[in-house]
């Protein structure tokens, strides 16, 4: 009688991470007495992955009955693959001997590969925020995908980028790998509604790519213009001046008025406006009682914004001669907030 | 689901032999090897050895080698093993277990004059 | 034949406690064939780890199970006080197959 083959039919079998995988193999003859086993691997250190007869395999499962008199098929089902099941499965007849079971005949392997989803991207920005004008690094990962091929884009407001490296890890063979990518944006003063998007491609996507996405009003700040204005006079002895805070992001904005080096008021920005491009605006007033002043007065509006160093400006207000007007709102769009006399 | 139930304690005394049944339910031992385990009291475990129903082929330890036989009835679904010339040092716990991932409930057996 | 040897042969914790549980093969065992069992008093084993690292249905994920050729560990992060009991390694990669002569984890 011909001797017994072990037949592998599938050279590979390729599945998608979460599903079952099917490994055919069959024998050609009974003989020899003694169970099949399939393996991961070959050698010494192959993985034992089903024993027909003893030890516990919870995610294996037979095609057919194997212990059916005249039963050939050895084919399995290993459920719920993951990318970790990945490598080259060999069934292996064994003749049964003493005192161990001795392999008699192996069949040629099917390499089982898995093809497993890269997990949604996720983008990072700078840790401090950064003004217009200066480049900033965004990062982008995701993990877990199989195959090694994956493609990944970098856009800003729908624009590609280009200034950007990436690398797939490991470089080597491995049952999933992770991109990591770093993009250089440019920040401009328009950026506050502005996004940077990560978009990964990869073959189980099935042409429907992932993206991650950041928002630049989390990494961008926008430094207040000031405009300090004297208005006209209110009544007989009383100034009015303004502090325009123009075009700043974000809102955490404190203004302090100093009169003469002293500090007049402080306040923290509230009811702001904001502009089409999500800055805001933001105008403090100041009602100075000129009688109570026998020289020349200088008015600083101080604006600590978001942390940084105050910025300010000045107005010299005479007071010499009868007051009158000494400049005029240009800010139609903004409302005053805070009156207060100076005595 | 799985079951294996065992036959009830024995009380024997050396020399004798005795006889534990272990009846499955839920598969068929044909599918599985089924073995024996020992466990003297405070003691740890010991294989025994097993049996491929299917065949009838079995594997022994050393040490139970020559007093121990194992058999299987298919048609009960039934393993069985018989233990002889027992000692005072055969007194324990005796387990069958289905391909070693199902453990039977256990019987006792006690070997004393 | 390959012997198993647990160590230690006790280990008193609290609960709460990290537990490691040692088992060292007298020759090489392939990792697939390297199982842990639970026994409490009174009860048979329950097979706990099987093929060295994979928790048996129903194992809490406090469990783990690592090593290779000759030596292999049972990891409990934190001990909950169903935990304590004899903890048997057990090897099936040639016969005659052996046990370890157990670790009793008892409360401190």
């Known amino acids: 009688e011909e001797e017994l083959q072990v037949i592998q039919p599938d050279k590979s079998v390729l599945v998608a991470a979460g599903e079952t995988a099917t490994l055919r193999c069959t024998a050609t003859s009974l003989i020899p007495v003694g169970p099949i086993q399939w393996f991961r691997g070959a050698g010494p250190g192959r993985e034992l992955i089903y024993n027909q007869k003893e030890g516990h395999f919870p995610r294996v499962t037979t095609v057919s009955d194997l212990t059916k008199r005249n039963n050939m098929d050895f084919s399995i089902r290993i459920g719920n693959i993951t990318p970790a099941d990945a490598g080259t499965y060999y069934c292996v007849k064994f003749r049964k001997g003493s005192p161990d079971d001795v392999e008699f005949k192996s069949g040629a392997g099917t390499e089982l590969s898995v093809r497993a989803k890269p997990s949604a991207p996720v983008v990072s920005g700078p840790a401090a925020r950064a003004t217009p004008q200066h480049t900033v690094s965004f990062t982008c990962e995701s993990h877990g995908f199989s195959p090694r091929d994956i493609t990944l884009k970098w856009f800003k407001n729908g624009n590609e980028l280009s200034d950007f490296q990436t690398n797939v890890d490991p470089v080597g063979e491995s049952v999933s790998y992770s991109i990591h990518s770093t993009a250089k944006v440019v920040l401009t003063r328009e950026d506050v509604h502005s996004q940077v998007i990560c978009e990964v491609a990869h073959v189980t996507l099935q042409g429907d790519p992932l993206r991650g996405t950041a928002n630049l009003s989390e990494t961008i700040r926008v430094p207040p213009t000031l405009e300090v204005t004297q208005q006209p006079v209110r009544a007989e002895n009383q100034v009015n001046v303004t502090c325009q805070v123009r075009k700043f992001y974000p809102q955490r904005l404190q203004l302090t008025w100093l009169e003469n080096g002293n500090v007049s008021r402080t306040e923290t920005a509230s009811t702001v406006t904001e502009n089409k491009d999500g800055t805001y605006n933001w105008m403090s007033w100041l009602l100075v009682n000129v009688s109570a002043h026998r020289d020349d007065v200088k008015l600083t509006c101080q604006v600590e914004h978001d942390g940084q160093p105050a910025v300010s400006k000045s107005h010299d207000l005479k007071v010499s001669a009868h007051p009158k007007e000494q400049g005029s709102n240009t800010a139609a769009e903004n409302t005053g907030s805070n009156e207060r006399n100076i005595y | 689901e799985v079951q294996l139930v065992q036959s009830g304690a024995e009380v024997k005394k050396p020399g004798a032999t005795v006889k534990i049944s272990c009846k499955a339910s839920g598969f068929n031992i044909k599918d599985y090897y089924m073995h024996w385990v020992q466990q003297a009291p405070g003691k740890g475990l010991e294989w025994i050895g097993r049996?491929?129903?299917?065949?009838?082929?079995?594997k022994y330890a050393p040490k139970f080698q020559g007093r121990v036989t194992i058999t299987a009835d298919t048609s009960t679904n039934t393993a069985y093993m018989e233990l002889s010339s027992l000692r005072s040092e055969d007194t324990a716990v005796y387990y069958c277990d289905r391909g070693l991932a199902y453990w039977g409930q256990g019987t006792l057996v006690t070997v004393s004059s | 034949e390959i012997v198993l040897t647990q160590s230690p042969a006790t280990l008193s914790l609290s609960p709460g406690e990290r537990a490691t549980l040692s088992c060292s093969a007298s020759?090489?065992?392939?990792?697939?064939?390297l199982y842990w069992y639970q026994q409490k008093p009174g009860q048979a084993p329950k097979l706990w780890i099987y093929?060295?690292?994979n928790l048996a249905s129903g194992i809490p994920a406090r469990f783990s199970g690592s090593g290779s050729g000759t030596d292999f560990t049972l990891t409990i992060s934190s001990l909950e006080p169903e935990d304590f009991a004899v903890y048997y390694c057990h090897q099936w990669s040639s016969y005659p197959y052996t046990f370890g002569q157990g670790t009793k984890l008892e409360i401190k």
């Open positions: 093929s060295t690292s």
């Open positions: 020759s090489s065992v392939s990792s697939s064939y």
């Open positions: 049996i491929d129903p299917e065949d009838a082929e079995t």
